[in-house]
Every structure is written in C-alpha cells, then in structure tokens.
C-alpha cells in the first residue's frame, strides 16, 4: 500500500485489544481544504514505541487503515480511497507493548466536516436566576454550533453538560452553579446539522468562584496605644484560601476571593468620615477609639457573609495633661498641641452612660500657641458638660481629618462639669470627741470623687473662735475623715471641709460648731 | 472462490432479538477484518460493525452501540451479529462483508414490526 492512500488490509500487528484506560482518545476529523482532509487525536500513556494508525469503515463495509507511525495527526486527499461524500466510521488504533489500544469512533461525511474552534479570548461569566450564565463571540465564520461544557469541582470528576444549538454571532450556555465550591468549566464546539462532525478541542479553563464567597476566618489583635497616640491592629489568623479544581490552581483568574476590611469609627461621630475600606493586607494604626472592624469576602458574584468585632476604647487616662480653666465667659481647655494645623476632636460622655451619649466638637484646623499648647473654649450658653456631673473626656487630633486611619489620641481624661467648686463641696460634715484634746472630723465623700484623677485633695479648716486662729489641714482624695488634736477644752470651734482639683479651689462646706467639754475630776 | 452466506433473519418484535450468521469460504477466514453492512428499503449501503481478523477489535456505528454484538469463530469460518432491542427503524437486508475487498453475500433479510 502506498502511504497515501488508504490500505484495504488489515493492519499489520497482531490482533490484542488491551483493554486499558490510556491509549487514542478525541479523534476529530475535518476537511481543511477543497480537497484535503485531517484527522487529529490525543494519546494517553507512555507514547515511547507507540505506533498510530487511523482506521475508516466505509459504507460499502470494506475497512482500511493509515499507518500514521507516531504521529498523532494524519492527513489525506480526496483521491486516498476515502468516500468523502457519503458517511465513514473512523477510529484510531495505537500498537504499543504488544498490544492495540482503540479510541472511541467518529461517524461523518467528510466533505461536510468543518474544523470547529472551542469559543477563543473573553469568556464572559455572570449570575442568572442561580445559574452561571457564559457568554462569548463565535469564532469567524462558524456561526450555527453545537456547544458542550464540562465542569469539575475540587472533590469531583469532568461532568458532561449540554448548552443547546448556537446560531448567532455570539454564543451562550446556561450552566449550574455551586454554592460553598468552586468549579473549573470547558466548553467545546461542533458544527451544527451536519451528522457525526468532529467535536473542537476543549477550551481554555473558565474558573468560577462558589455563589458564597467563604465566610472569613480571621482573628485580630490590637496592640497598646503608642506615645504617638496610635495602635496598630494585627491579623492573627489569615483566611483560609479557597480549594481549587485542578486547571485552576496556580493561575485561576474568576475564582479570586477578596478580603476587604471595613473600618467603622465610633468615637467622635462629629467627624466628616466615619466609615473607611481597606484590603486586608494592609492593617492600619488606629487611634484609641473604639471601633467596629469588619471582614468582608467578595467574588465576581458580589460580597459573602462578613464577620464583625468589636475594638473597645483605650481607656487609658492622663490625668495632668489637660489643663482647664473656668472663667466668667465661659471654659477653655489646654493641652499640648500635637503639630502644625492640627484638627481636633473634643468628645465627652457622662460617666457611666451609654457611649451612644458621647457629644462632640471638632475644632478648625489649629497652629500651637506660644506656649506649645492648643484650645478648645465654649460658653456656659452651649451648655456643653454643663452638667454637674463626671464627663470623660478624649481628644483626637488629625492633620487629614478626611482619612478615618490618621486619627490619633492625645488624651482621655476626667473632668467634672457645671460648677464644680460649689458641686463639689462635701456634705454631712460631723466632729465627734476623740479625746480630752482631739476630735475626729467625717464627711461624705465629695461629688468630685466620682471623677477619676479630678479631686486633688480635701482641705480641712478649724478656725478657734477665741482667738480667730485658723489651721488647714490636707487630707487626701481618698481620705474622708481627719483627727483635729492640740484643741483646748473649752473653747469654742468651727471646722469647714472643702474639695480641691488640680485648677480649681473648691467651696467650704457649712461651718460647723463645736467644743471640748471641761471634763470635771470627782 | 470466496463465498459469503448470511442466515438468521426473519420477522420480529420492537424490544426483540436475532443473531444473524455468516459463513465463510474460498478463504483465509481468520487473516481478514469483517464487516456487517445493511441497506434499508429505498436506502443506500450503511455500515454497522467491524470485527478485526483475530476478534480483538471490534467498532460500531453510534446507533447500534450497546444493542449488537459482532463476533467470530475463526475455527468454523463463521461470524455473528447479535442485535437485542430491535427497533423498527434496524429494518433492513443485512450483508456480511469482507473487509479488505469488500465482496460480500446475498443478504438476509430483517423485519422489525408488531
């Protein structure tokens, strides 16, 4: 036989079907001209001392063979002994190990076989109605298709899905789409109408993402503020990546899972942004706010579940670094300016309520005084912490009031609002003898001691109404009872308690009488 | 000479079975692929099975995979098609064919009608 044509015997190798997974698969034949033919196919397995021959059956029942040698392609003219008008089976044959090895056969008319092209370039993928809608152009020329996909999940096999006839200048295929897994899907073309045409090869991998982007798994930790008035949050735990299916690891555009963090700034609900969004790569320094973080996972399909926590508010004060002054016209706060035009944040809540309480005020943008100090004053009218209460007081400071992660702290600290001087004055004042010269003075504690690092000190005064000599004596804040001694029997006393802070003298309480009886011997 | 005659055929039932029998002369049975062919009324040759020469490889039309059987007995020079699950449409003259020259018998002739 001559090696163009195809040889009426039967091949020349024994006859043993090995029976075995590997060997000739996806045989496609097509004409390639007006009168030239190819036949293509895949082989699986060990190719070394492979030989290939491509077996037809024509109609008439008489069968013949090319001997394609290890090639995996072969082609022929219409002279071949070949019908290429009327309907052959053709099969692939590979001798290997003294043994044949069969792919499946193609049954076509030859001439009418058109080499198909799988769908080329942009693949585009949506979401419709719970199901995975792909859309592509056809390829030039080949308008009216057959389309098939196949798809696979991490943990399954190739699925077989048919995505109906195609006429159109661009073709679509309706395929399932899994919820928690993500799938990888090829889709493959043949010519529509036209008995027993050659399947194109599969396409490029589609790799789609689960409907649910996973649920993130992280855990976060927030360091200690810094001098700087900032602490950097931390990703203890990173998020698990999602499994892939074979053709999409490495590589696998479509399947992406972004983590985005939402930061939510609760405190100072003054400010012009309290909402900000950011890759979860890139862990931010916040203040000593509380906050509300958010991990958010997306894919193509839009944003998944998110998991939220909750970052308290530093709490740690400093008691001196806020200076407040009170006079007629109103109150006026100082503290140590952080730099050159520097908007502040002045917030304050009562003590023990709600911190959806918290009032504020944000100051225009502000240079340091001469003394290196900046200010905040308001009017008794506003009647901002006009109270006669404990306020807790925070001041941030940002120079990009507009970015929610340059804020910092400055200070967090405790202030007693309204009059304090005369609000803090200390009632139910009582002298009780303690001995023949001394008397132990009690009071209730002052309001100003409900106020952390307000109340300075309580003063206590004994004024001898004999002489009008006066004694002060300092007790400390914790301290609401002083022992009085060197007193004379006799004489008659009047002791008044009032409670300091840092900036202010307070009011003295009721004077109250009193005297050492003359203790008289039997 | 060669000399191909098919047996088996007659008149059947949707859902039943035949096996049709070819036996062969004239030559070296068991050195050649054979073929089964039919020819519908008013329609041209199509082809159905391939055997190979030892039996090894067998090949099927799409239409009547899972439903014939091809088979041979190279020592009594005889080949076999098995068909189950006849449908109306396997009506036809059924020929044995030999494969590298394609002479072939006078047929037999199958029915598939209730």
């Known amino acids: 036989c001559r090696t163009s044509e195809c040889c009426f015997q039967d091949p020349p190798y024994p006859d043993a079907d090995s029976g075995s997974a590997s060997g000739p698969r996806d045989l496609r034949c097509y004409r390639i001209s007006s009168d030239r033919y190819e036949c293509s196919w895949q082989y699986e397995g060990p190719t070394a001392g492979v030989s290939h021959f491509l077996r037809c059956c024509l109609s008439s029942g008489r069968c013949c063979y090319f001997a394609a040698g290890s090639a995996t392609r072969l082609q022929f003219s219409d002279q071949a002994g070949v019908s290429v008008l009327y309907t052959v089976t053709l099969w692939v044959e590979s001798w290997a190990r003294n043994q044949t090895e069969k792919s499946p056969e193609v049954t076509l008319q030859l001439y009418n076989s058109v080499k198909y092209e799988p769908p080329l370039g942009d693949i585009k993928v949506s979401k419709l109605a719970g199901q995975l809608r792909m859309e592509w152009e056809t390829p030039d020329n080949q308008v009216g298709a057959e389309v098939q996909f196949r798809h696979r999940t991490p943990s399954s096999p190739w699925k077989l899905g048919d995505c109906g006839p195609q006429d159109d200048d661009t073709e679509s295929c309706l395929c399932p789409l899994e919820m928690n897994v993500a799938q990888e899907f090829q889709l493959r073309r043949r010519q529509l109408g036209s008995q027993g045409s050659s399947w194109s090869k599969w396409s490029s991998p589609v790799c789609v993402p689960p409907e649910n982007p996973p649920q993130p798994q992280v855990r976060f930790s927030v360091e200690q503020l810094g001098q700087d008035g900032r602490r950097r949050l931390t990703l203890k735990e990173q998020p698990t990546q999602l499994e892939l299916p074979e053709g999409c690891q490495g590589l696998a555009p479509g399947t992406e899972v972004t983590y985005r963090l939402q930061l939510h700034m609760l405190s100072c609900p003054c400010k012009a942004k309290a909402t900000r969004t950011l890759h979860l790569g890139k862990m931010p320094y916040l203040s000593g706010a509380a906050y509300n973080v958010a991990v958010i996972s997306s894919n193509q399909f839009g944003p998944g579940l998110n998991q939220t926590w909750h970052i308290p508010a530093d709490t740690h004060t400093e008691p001196v670094a806020l200076n407040i002054s009170v006079g007629t016209n109103g109150t006026t706060m100082y503290w140590p300016a952080r730099a050159q035009s520097m908007t502040y944040c002045i917030e304050w809540q009562p003590v023990g309520q709600d911190g959806g309480l918290a009032t504020c005020s944000l100051t225009a943008p502000q240079d340091p005084d001469p003394a290196g100090m900046a200010t905040y004053s308001w009017s008794r009218e506003s009647g901002a912490m006009g109270q006669e209460k404990c306020y807790y007081i925070t001041i941030f400071a940002s120079a990009h009031p507009e970015k929610l992660t340059l804020w910092s702290t400055v200070l967090s600290t405790y202030h007693f609002g309204g009059n304090a001087s005369a609000a803090g004055t200390p009632h139910h004042v009582s002298v009780k003898n303690h001995s023949l010269d001394s008397v132990s003075v009690d009071w209730a504690p002052s309001l100003l001691s409900t106020c952390p690092g307000v109340l300075k000190e309580y003063v206590v005064r004994c004024r001898d109404e004999d002489s009008k000599q006066v004694s002060e004596h300092p007790v400390q804040p914790t301290e609401t009872q002083v022992t009085l001694s060197g007193l004379r029997a006799g004489v008659a006393y009047t002791v008044q308690v009032r409670a300091d802070t840092a900036w202010l003298r307070g009011v003295w309480s009721q004077p109250q009488r009193f005297s050492i009886e003359v203790q008289v011997s039997d | 000479q060669l000399q191909l005659v098919e047996s088996g055929g007659g008149l059947v039932q949707p859902g039943g079975s035949l096996r049709l029998s070819c036996a062969a002369s004239g030559f070296t049975f068991s050195s050649y692929g054979m073929s089964w062919v039919r020819q519908a009324p008013g329609k041209g040759l199509e082809w159905v099975s391939y055997i190979s020469a030892g039996g090894g490889t067998t090949t099927y039309v799409d239409f009547v995979k899972g439903r014939f059987t091809i088979s041979r007995d190279n020592a009594k020079n005889m080949l076999y098609l098995q068909m189950n699950s006849l449908k109306p449409e396997d009506t036809a003259v059924y020929y044995c064919?030999?494969?590298?020259?394609?002479?072939r018998g006078q047929g037999t002739q199958v029915t598939v009608s209730s």
């Open positions: 064919v030999h494969a590298a020259d394609g002479s």
